[in-house]
Structures are given as structure tokens and as C-alpha cells.
Interface confidence: low
């Protein structure tokens, strides 16, 4: 049986785990491993510690779909429309750039509804608070080492984490990437920014006509999202959620700061958007150090990939 | 050809330091894991360490006397404070089961 | 510390017999099949016969054939020929942060009659 280990249970993680079961039609044993407490990546929902019914998307706020990616991933739009794991947005957002065309969904479970729905139909053994350190090849198979717990071993490994962690790993990774190709992942480049999920008492009212803003004239927010309102889920029972999105200059200024003196600037920054707001019951502070990809770069061009070589280990 | 040759062996007295080296050609150490591995006279064989790209490894019973490192072509294994028991033939192979022929050491009064 | 017991330490085998050699690990190889088998005749490095359990080296014949997993491996010579007289050897690959990363069994000297 083929054993194949997935690092990075995001948006690419569990997509890849969902269609390597459905491509595959022998027996496959999938497992994907994440450092977080949970899955979402990127895409992740943080919930209220005192009502799990109130959530708040810290990352992806919506899906956007070009006319392109329409035709292209229809079957995947079609899909998560079915199934409910995605609606259209039909709450105002406003100062959002539309292209003629464009059509934006919103997942009224949380963003990260959408990697569980993947896993859960990958059938992949989904572990957390997986760390990977090391990739070494022995006996034709990568043995994979994680800060804690002994290595393990797969036939196939895909990383999907952000480009700066890979090149952190150590072990023979660090040789079977070529220089060419480093230089080419050491091209990609990320902006940083934080989030910040307030979550408020069932009956607390938020008196703004839009559902989420983006802001052009704060130095440090860039968006603003009532967040149980951008989803169409605004109930009596449940109180309301904001996230609020820093600017990417603010996330760099601020990226080694503690989160909690982020947290006071941002809460200050936001009584000159939206005054009076009340006390939130709880507060989620979440630091995006690789929280978008201004420059994707590509690997191309390099001589043959030395990543399929097979040496055996040890013995 | 792809082959490993130790060198480096010979006689010494006990408390001696000494260094063997691994002489590889053919094939690039950074593809390839190296083990050390010595047989006392008549008798079996025993792990001393390993090498990879990720670090090295030794045995628990070496204790700290036994040093493996590399160059682009060379795996050298530093022995310190040896005593008479350390007499033996010393392999160095690759992980894939290519041996060099062995250099022997023998420490002696 | 990982340990490799092989059985019996010595044989004896007549031309075209059949000849079994045991190996038991204290705790299982990496991935239930990292064990190699070895042959050694005096003067000469180890020759790798077997990989992966169960897996022929190049340019082995295959009158050698290895079996096993987890902790129990066995080693099988059919129609064994004089060139066969040597001393072998199991190898395990264990998990280096648990312990060693490789131990050798004891050996088991083969002598064809």
C-alpha cells in the first residue's frame, strides 16, 4: 500500500488529499500533518471560547472566482455549492475591487469548512500539532522526523507550507533541492499582517450598513468584517464577531512585537473607525507571518531534479 | 566506479588518539548516508556511527570518544583515548551496501 | 539498546542441502522491514545478500531468499553449493532517536560438508 504524507492541512493540503483519493484507485494510506492545533491554514475559523456557535474567520474572508477559475474549477464550485459548504456573498463589502465577471462566495460555516470538507472526504488520518524538522531519504522511502515522537516513513511527501518554512527543514532535503532551485523558492516572497477576531455578547448590536470594509486611510487596519453578517448567519442566540485585518506595512513594523501590544494598538486604531464599539467577551489575535504571496515565483529551468534519486538507508 | 577506501590504520599504543579516513569516489556524499562499522579479530561486526546530510548518529556504546565528519569527498572517523579493546578492522560502507576493504587498527603496549 | 539475536551461531550443511538462519530483534526495524542480510568470507569486507527483508541484492543468485517482518527475520539457502562457506550477518536499521540507528547480529557460521 502506498503510504503517502500531506504537510500542511490548508486550503492546498487538504485539496490534494481529497483528489489523491479520488485519482487513486489501489488501496492508499494518506496522512496529513499540521503544526496548528487544527485544520484551516490560512483558512482558519477561531471560535468563541464561550459560544463555539460564534466564530470569526481569521484568514480568507471570501472566496473570489474569475471567469477563468469559473470555467476551469467548476466542478469544485459546484460541489461546495451543493453541499452548502459555500454561499454567494450577497452582504455588502464595501471598497471591494470587482472585475467584470468575478463572482465571491462566502462559506456560512466558517472558511475553514472548506478544508474539512476536503479532508473529511480524503479519508486521510489528519494529525495536529505535527511539526516537521527533518526529510531523509532511507531505503528508497522519505523519513520524515517532527519535533516530538519518532520519524516516520512514506513513499511520497507533498509540502504545502509556506516556501520559508521548507527551507527551514534540515536532513537531506537540504541537498536534493538544487542551488537553482533554492534560488528560485528563495525568490517567492510573502507579506505579514495580523488578525484580530473580537467576539461580543448574544444581543450586542453593531450598527454599520455594510457587512465588511476595506479602509484606505488608516496606517494600520485594512479591513473591517462583521463577520456573522458577511456570512448570513445573524441570530438573536449567538453574538456577533469583527475581524479586523492590519495593513501589510503595520504587520511588518509590528511582526516581532508581542501580541498583546498589538492587540492595544489595534483596538485603538479601531475606536477611529467604529466608535463606541462595546467590550468584546473575547479577543483572538492571530499573527500572519506568511499571509499572502505579492511574488509567486515558479520552478523552471533548472537541470534534472534530484528529487527522485534512490539511496538506501542504512543497511 | 563507485567505491570507498579506508586508510589510516596501524599501530598504537593505548591513549592514543587516531583518525581513519574514507576515501570515496564515483558518487557525491552528499547523495549518500555512511556508516562506520568495526570487527575485533574473529570476531562479529559492530556499529560505531553514521553520517547524513541531517547530522550524525553513534552508538550509545561510544560514549563520546568517536567523532564522524565529512568533506566533499572524505568521511573521517576521530578516535580518542583508545585502549586495547579498540583493536579491530574499521569499515566504512554506504547506505546502500557498498564496503570499502577495511584498515585495521591495532592498539597495543 | 537495540539487539539482533541470530540462531544458530553455527551450521553445518551438505552440497545441495538447505540451510536456515534465524534473527530476532528486541524491538521491530524501522517500517517492519529494514533488515539487510550480509555474507562474509576472512579477509573480505561484508558482501550485502538481502535488503528490505526480503528484497535480492544485485547479482545475488537466488538460491538466497529472506523472509520476515517486524522482529523475526529468517534467512533461507536452497541448493547450497561450496562457495556458500562463510560467516553471516543480519542487520537492523532501527529509529536513531530511540536508540542505535543500526545493530549487527551475532553471526552464524555456515560450513558446507
Known amino acids: 500500500m502506498a503510504q503517502v504524507l500531506i504537510v500542511g492541512a490548508g486550503m492546498t493540503g487538504s485539496l490534494c488529499a481529497a483528489l489523491l483519493r479520488r485519482q487513486t484507485s489501489g488501496p492508499l494510506y494518506l496522512a496529513v500533518w499540521d503544526k496548528a492545533e487544527d485544520s484551516g491554514g490560512r483558512m482558519t475559523t477561531a471560535c468563541s471560547p464561550h459560544n463555539p456557535q460564534c466564530t470569526a474567520d481569521l484568514g480568507a474572508q471570501y472566496i473570489t472566482c474569475t471567469p477563468h477559475y469559473a470555467k476551469k474549477h467548476q466542478r469544485f464550485y459546484d460541489e461546495l455549492l451543493a453541499y452548502g459548504v459555500l454561499r454567494p456573498l450577497s452582504s455588502p463589502i464595501e471598497g471591494m475591487v470587482m472585475k467584470e465577471g468575478d463572482c465571491n462566495f462566502v462559506a456560512p460555516q466558517g472558511i475553514s469548512s472548506i478544508i474539512k470538507h476536503y479532508l473529511k472526504e480524503s479519508g486521510a488520518e489528519v494529525y495536529f500539532r505535527h511539526r516537521v524538522t527533518q526529510i531523509n531519504l532511507r531505503d528508497d522511502k522519505w523519513e520524515v522526523s517532527k519535533q516530538t515522537g519518532s520519524p516516520e516513513q512514506f513513499d511520497l511527501i507533498v509540502l504545502t507550507m509556506p516556501v520559508p518554512e521548507i527551507l527551514q527543514l534540515q536532513g537531506d532535503i537540504t541537498t536534493l533541492i538544487s542551488e537553482c532551485q533554492r534560488q528560485q523558492l528563495e525568490a517567492v516572497s510573502y507579506s505579514s499582517r495580523y488578525a484580530l477576531g473580537l467576539f461580543y455578547e448574544a444581543g450586542t448590536k453593531i450598527d454599520v450598513p455594510w457587512a465588511g470594509q476595506y479602509i484606505t486611510s488608516n496606517p494600520c487596519i485594512r479591513f473591517v468584517s462583521i463577520d456573522n453578517k458577511k456570512r448570513n448567519i445573524e441570530s438573536s442566540e449567538i453574538g456577533p464577531s469583527l475581524v479586523i485585518h492590519t495593513t501589510v506595512p503595520f504587520g511588518v513594523t509590528y511582526l516581532e512585537h508581542s501580541i498583546e501590544d498589538v492587540q492595544e494598538l489595534v483596538f485603538q486604531q479601531l475606536e477611529n473607525i467604529l466608535p463606541g464599539l462595546p467590550q468584546p467577551i473575547a479577543t483572538k489575535c492571530q499573527k500572519w507571518r506568511h499571509s499572502q504571496v505579492p511574488s509567486a515565483g515558479v520552478i523552471l529551468g533548472c537541470a534534472k531534479s534530484p528529487w527522485m534519486m534512490a539511496i538506501g538507508f542504512p543497511i | 566506479c563507485q567505491s570507498l577506501e579506508e586508510s589510516g590504520g596501524r599501530l598504537v599504543t593505548p591513549g592514543t588518539p587516531l583518525t581513519l579516513t574514507c576515501t570515496v569516489s564515483?558518487?557525491?556524499?552528499?547523495?549518500?548516508?555512511i556508516y562506520w562499522v568495526r570487527q575485533a579479530p574473529g570476531k562479529g561486526l559492530e556499529y560505531i556511527g553514521i553520517i547524513f546530510n541531517g547530522g550524525t548518529y553513534y552508538a550509545r556504546w561510544t560514549k563520546g570518544r568517536f567523532t564522524i565528519s565529512k568533506t566533499s569527498t572524505t568521511v573521517d572517523l576521530k578516535m580518542t583515548s583508545l585502549t586495547t579493546e579498540d583493536t579491530a578492522t574499521y569499515f566504512c560502507?554506504?547506505?546502500?551496501?557498498?564496503w570499502g576493504p577495511g584498515t585495521l587498527v591495532t592498539v597495543s603496549l | 539498546a537495540q539487539v539482533l539475536t541470530q540462531t544458530p551461531a553455527s551450521v553445518s550443511a551438505a552440497v545441495g542441502g538447505t540451510v536456515t538462519i534465524n534473527c530476532q530483534a528486541s524491538?521491530?526495524?524501522?517500517?517492519?522491514?529494514?533488515l539487510a542480510w550480509y555474507q562474509q568470507k576472512p579477509g573480505q569486507p561484508p558482501k550485502r545478500l538481502i535488503y528490505?527483508?526480503?528484497t535480492l541484492a544485485s547479482g545475488v543468485s537466488s538460491r538466497f531468499k529472506g523472509s520476515g517482518s517486524g522482529t523475526e527475520f529468517t534467512l533461507t539457502m536452497s541448493g547450497v553449493e561450496c562457495d556458500d562457506a562463510a560467516t553471516y550477518y543480519c542487520a537492523g536499521s532501527f529509529d536513531c532517536n530511540s536508540g542505535d540507528c543500526v545493530a549487527f547480529g551475532g553471526g552464524t557460521e555456515v560450513v558446507v560438508k
Open positions: 564515483g558518487f557525491s556524499l552528499n547523495n549518500y548516508h
Open positions: 528490505s527483508a526480503s
Open positions: 560502507a554506504r547506505g546502500d551496501g557498498i
Open positions: 524491538q521491530s526495524v524501522f517500517n517492519n522491514n529494514y
